[in-house]
């Protein structure tokens, strides 16, 4: 969380951003919110990239003002209009890019004055694991598959009963390239499964974790997924 | 400590050509925009042009369109100024300025600059 | 573009005094505005973002005000160290634009 004060002259509203992560080729949240105030027209909201040379975004006057909007930004943001009266200025950012990574600010001003706070971004994919048995194998064997990460991840077994044992020996991880050059397929194996256990399959890189867990008995299957994010710290 | 360092001017007759460098240090120099100023001799501050971090995007004061191209070598950490079909109009000492966020886009460093000279 | 107006372009003062330099925007900035010192073959110095916020470093003698089109930069009591020409830049847009500047010099 990072909370800015602005000063302008005696005049200071209070900016809060929280650190996220977008998943590229879906749509993001930027979170801004400031301390609101009764008119809509008196807000101004600009949102900048360190780097960039035109505005991410800017709404004025109770609409959206685009004629210094950056071209790499273009036809892809867009505020929730009818929260900004209530003091959101978050900011939707649609079909996530690797490139939108980096320093953003959200810059308001009111009638009240004047504040701003940093967020760092961070864009990559990220998606929710899926265990199986794999009947085709020889041997009782679990298939891990999560079909978008980047950048690569690590993958690590566990199992609630041997908790702490190293599986690297009995499993075998492989990354697949998706179709578009960037993202990756994570597929990993898991030899030499016993009964009546529950194993997790752990995928981690610096923005995501996903676990995926499967419970196997001699007359059930039981599955469960969880995804968190990584960096959500807020300014 | 962050720092700019200009390099390459000098004498060049009118029509000439001449490339300015910029090297940086002490900062990521990839995550911001950079530009060029001048400022003729006894004259104000002229903002001639910048790029983006990424170099993708660049933008030009309308004296030098058409002339002068802005690069940058992210690898190295430099900052370019091609300057072709020079004019007597062009002598000024050039400064390579990086704007910041935390400034509000105000050039908050600078370099020492370097002298061009446009003279027959 | 958006065109930058200093004034005065001179100004002739005292160790002690209060120096208030206007700078005037040709359409609304907001307060895209950055006060800038420079001496003679030295390099700008960024004194004043956002229209009034102060640099690192800055002395607080030195303050900015104004928004939209009408801004001044206040020093409210004149050191030997000051003597030196003030430009304004907005950052609103490109191309980017300075004032003119203004030279401060001892009376």
């Known amino acids: 969380l990072i909370i800015g004060f602005g000063i302008s002259g005696r005049h200071s509203i209070t900016v809060t951003t929280v650190a996220s992560a977008g998943n590229i080729g879906e749509d993001g949240i930027l979170s801004c919110t400031f301390e609101p105030d009764i008119k809509l027209s008196d807000i101004v909201i600009q949102w900048l990239k360190e780097g960039v040379l035109g505005l991410v975004h800017e709404f004025k006057e109770g609409k959206d003002e685009l004629s210094e909007q950056d071209e790499m930004f273009r036809g892809r943001t867009a505020v929730f209009a009818d929260q900004v009266i209530v003091g959101n200025a978050s900011l939707r950012l649609k079909n996530v890019q690797l490139t939108d990574a980096g320093t953003y600010k959200c810059y308001i001003i009111t009638s009240k004055g004047k504040g701003n706070a940093n967020l760092e971004y961070k864009t990559g994919a990220f998606s929710m694991p899926e265990v199986n048995v794999d009947y085709n194998a020889s041997s009782e064997t679990l298939r891990c598959e999560a079909p978008r990460w980047f950048p690569q991840p690590t993958v690590v077994w566990a199992s609630q009963v041997d908790q702490g044992a190293n599986f690297s020996e009995v499993s075998n991880t492989s990354f697949e390239l998706n179709s578009e050059n960037v993202t990756m397929k994570v597929v990993s194996v898991l030899y030499n499964v016993t009964i009546n256990n529950t194993y997790s399959c752990m995928i981690e890189n610096d923005i995501a974790k996903a676990t995926g867990d499967i419970k196997v008995t001699e007359s059930e299957i039981k599955r469960r997924s969880h995804l968190q994010l990584l960096n959500s710290k807020a300014s | 400590e962050v720092q700019l360092l200009e390099s390459g001017g000098g004498l060049v007759q009118p029509g000439g050509s001449l490339r300015l460098s910029c090297a940086a240090s002490?900062?990521?120099?990839?995550?911001?925009?950079m530009s060029w100023v001048r400022q003729a001799p006894g004259k104000g501050l002229e903002w001639v042009s910048a790029i983006s971090g990424s170099g993708g995007s660049t933008s030009y004061a309308d004296s030098v369109k058409g002339r002068f191209t802005i690069s940058r070598d992210n690898s190295k950490n430099t900052l370019y100024l091609q300057m072709n079909s020079l004019r007597a109009e062009d002598t000024a000492v050039y400064y390579c300025a990086k704007p910041s966020l935390a400034t509000m886009l105000a050039f908050d460093i600078w370099g020492q600059g370097t002298m061009v000279t446009v003279s027959s | 573009d958006i065109q930058m107006t200093q004034s005065p372009s001179t100004l002739s003062a005292s160790v002690g005094d209060r120096v208030t330099i206007t700078c005037r925007a040709s359409q609304s900035i907001s307060s895209w505005l950055a006060w800038y010192q420079q001496k003679p073959g030295k390099a700008p110095k960024l004194l004043i973002y956002d229209a009034s916020s102060l640099e690192s470093g800055v002395p607080s003698r030195f303050s900015g005000s104004g928004s939209g089109t009408e801004f001044t930069l206040t020093i409210s009591s004149l050191q030997p160290d000051d003597f030196a020409t003030y430009y304004c830049q907005q950052s609103k847009s490109y191309p980017r634009t300075f004032g003119g500047g203004t030279k401060v010099e001892i009376k």
């Open positions: 002490g900062f990521t120099f990839s995550s911001y925009a």
